[in-house]
Interface confidence: medium
C-alpha cells in the first residue's frame, strides 16, 4: 500500500506516534517519506547483507527476522514480512522500540539527513487530524 501524506499522518497518530519520545508527528511522516516514499512494501538491501523493510525501513540485522541476515538480533521479535503489511501496526510498534533505544530518530538515516532540523510540521499541514 502507498499511503497518502495525510492518510499516513492520521494512521500514525491513531497508533500513538505523535510526540512519542518527544518526536512530533511531522517527524514520523517526514521519515516515512524519505525512507519509503510512503510505500509499506518497500525493501532495500544493504551492503552488510541486511535488508530494510516497510514504510519506516526497519533493518533486519537488528530489529526483525528475515531468515537470512547473519547474526540477526530480531529485537522487535517479528518476521520482517510483517513490516510490509498495509496495516502499519507492526512497523509502528517496532519503531517505538527503536526510537526508545538511545539514539532517538537518529536511527533513521533518512530522517537525520532529510528531516532533522527542518520544518517537519509542513508534512502534516492541511491534514485533518
Amino acid at each position: 500500500k502507498v499511503f497518502g501524506r495525510c492518510e499516513l499522518a492520521a494512521a500514525m497518530k491513531r497508533h500513538g506516534l505523535d510526540n512519542y519520545r518527544g518526536y512530533s508527528l511531522g517527524n514520523w511522516v517526514c521519515a516515512a517519506k524519505f525512507e519509503s516514499n510512503f510505500n509499506t512494501q518497500a525493501t532495500n538491501r544493504n551492503t552488510d547483507g541486511s535488508t530494510d523493510y516497510g514504510i519506516l525501513q526497519i533493518n533486519s540485522r537488528w530489529w526483525c527476522n528475515d531468515g537470512r541476515t547473519p547474526g540477526s538480533r530480531n529485537l522487535c521479535n517479528i518476521p520482517c514480512s510483517a513490516l510490509l503489511s498495509s496495516d502499519i501496526t507492526a512497523s509502528v510498534n517496532c519503531a517505538k522500540k527503536i526510537v526508545s533505544d538511545g539514539n532517538g530518530m537518529n536511527a533513521w538515516v533518512a530522517w537525520r539527513n532529510r528531516c532533522k532540523g527542518t520544518d517537519v510540521q509542513a508534512w502534516i499541514r492541511g491534514c485533518r487530524l
Partner: antibody
Framework: QVQLQESGAEVMKPGASVKISCKAT????????IEWVKQRPGHGLEWIGE????????YYNEKFKGKATFTADTSSNTAYMQLSSLTSEDSAVYYC?????????WGQGTTLTVSS | DIELTQSPATLSVTPGDSVSLSCRAS??????LHWYQQKPHESPRLLIK???QRESGIPSRFSGSGSGTDFTLSINSVETEDFGMYFC?????????FGGGTKLEIK
C-alpha cells in the same frame, strides 16, 4: 520438515515462454525469500534472483532482467518463475531454494530444454 | 559482481586421502562464503556455511576455513560417497555468485 517441490521437465520451442513452479511446505512460506538458480553444464550455478512471497518484493540479477519474472501465491505456498523469449541458451536445470543467505533447502530442479 | 575462483578444477584422489579445495574471491567477503556438494542428477547440498560452520548432519571429516578472499574446504580421509562436484557461494553482496566448481573424482 522443509521441502520445495518443483514442477516437471519442460520441452519448449524457441520464442515461447514457460512458467516453473516451486511449492513450499514445512515452514512459513511468506516470511522467507525464495531464490532461483540456473545450472547449465560447463557454466556452473548462476543466481537469477529472489522473491519475498509475503510482499511480492523481487530482485533480479541484471543478467536476467527481462528474461525471468517471479511471482508467488501465498494461498498455495507456491512460487513461480516465468522465462520468456526462450532460446537454446535457456536450456538448463532451474532450482528454487529457500534464501537464508546460504541455501540449505533446494527443490529437486526443473529441466528445461529449448529446441525447435 | 564478486567473482569466485575455485581450484583445482578437478582433483583425482584415492579413498582415505585427505584433500583441500580452494575458493578465492575477487574482493573481500569477510566470512560470507558457503560450500556445497552436488552429485550427478541431484540438487546441491549445503556442507559449510559462513566459511567454517558445518551444517547439521554433515560428517565431521568436512571442515572449512578462511576469511576475506581465501577459503578452503578440507575433507579428512575421503570416502567413496564424497565424490562429486563442490561449489562455493558468496552471500556478501548481490548478485549472489558461485564458484565454477571442483570435481572430486576417484583416481
Amino acid at each position: 520438515q522443509v521441502q520445495l517441490q518443483e514442477s516437471g521437465a519442460e520441452v519448449m520451442k524457441p520464442g515461447a515462454s514457460v512458467k516453473i513452479s516451486c511449492k513450499a511446505t514445512g515452514y512459513t512460506f511468506s516470511t522467507y525469500w525464495i531464490e532461483w538458480v540456473k545450472q547449465r553444464p560447463g557454466h556452473g550455478l548462476e543466481w537469477i534472483g529472489e522473491i519475498l512471497p509475503g510482499s511480492g518484493s523481487t530482485y533480479y540479477n541484471e543478467k536476467f532482467k527481462g528474461k525471468a519474472t517471479f511471482t508467488a501465491d501465498t494461498s498455495s505456498n507456491t512460487a513461480y518463475m516465468q522465462l520468456s523469449s526462450l532460446t537454446s541458451e535457456d536450456s538448463a536445470v532451474y532450482y528454487c531454494a529457500r534464501g537464508d543467505g546460504w541455501y540449505c533447502y533446494w527443490g529437486q530442479g526443473t529441466t528445461l530444454t529449448v529446441s525447435s | 559482481d564478486i567473482e569466485l575462483t575455485q581450484s583445482p578444477a578437478t582433483l583425482s584422489v584415492t579413498p582415505g586421502d585427505s584433500v583441500s579445495l580452494s575458493c578465492r574471491a575477487s574482493q573481500s567477503i569477510s566470512n560470507n562464503l558457503h560450500w556445497y556438494q552436488q552429485k550427478p542428477h541431484e540438487s546441491p547440498r549445503l556442507l559449510i556455511k559462513y566459511a567454517s560452520q558445518r551444517e547439521s548432519g554433515i560428517p565431521s571429516r568436512f571442515s572449512g576455513s578462511g576469511s576475506g578472499t581465501d577459503f578452503t574446504l578440507s575433507i579428512n580421509s575421503v570416502e567413496t560417497e564424497d565424490f562429486g562436484m563442490y561449489f562455493c557461494q558468496q552471500s556478501n553482496s548481490w548478485p549472489r555468485t558461485f564458484g565454477g566448481g571442483t570435481k572430486l573424482e576417484i583416481k
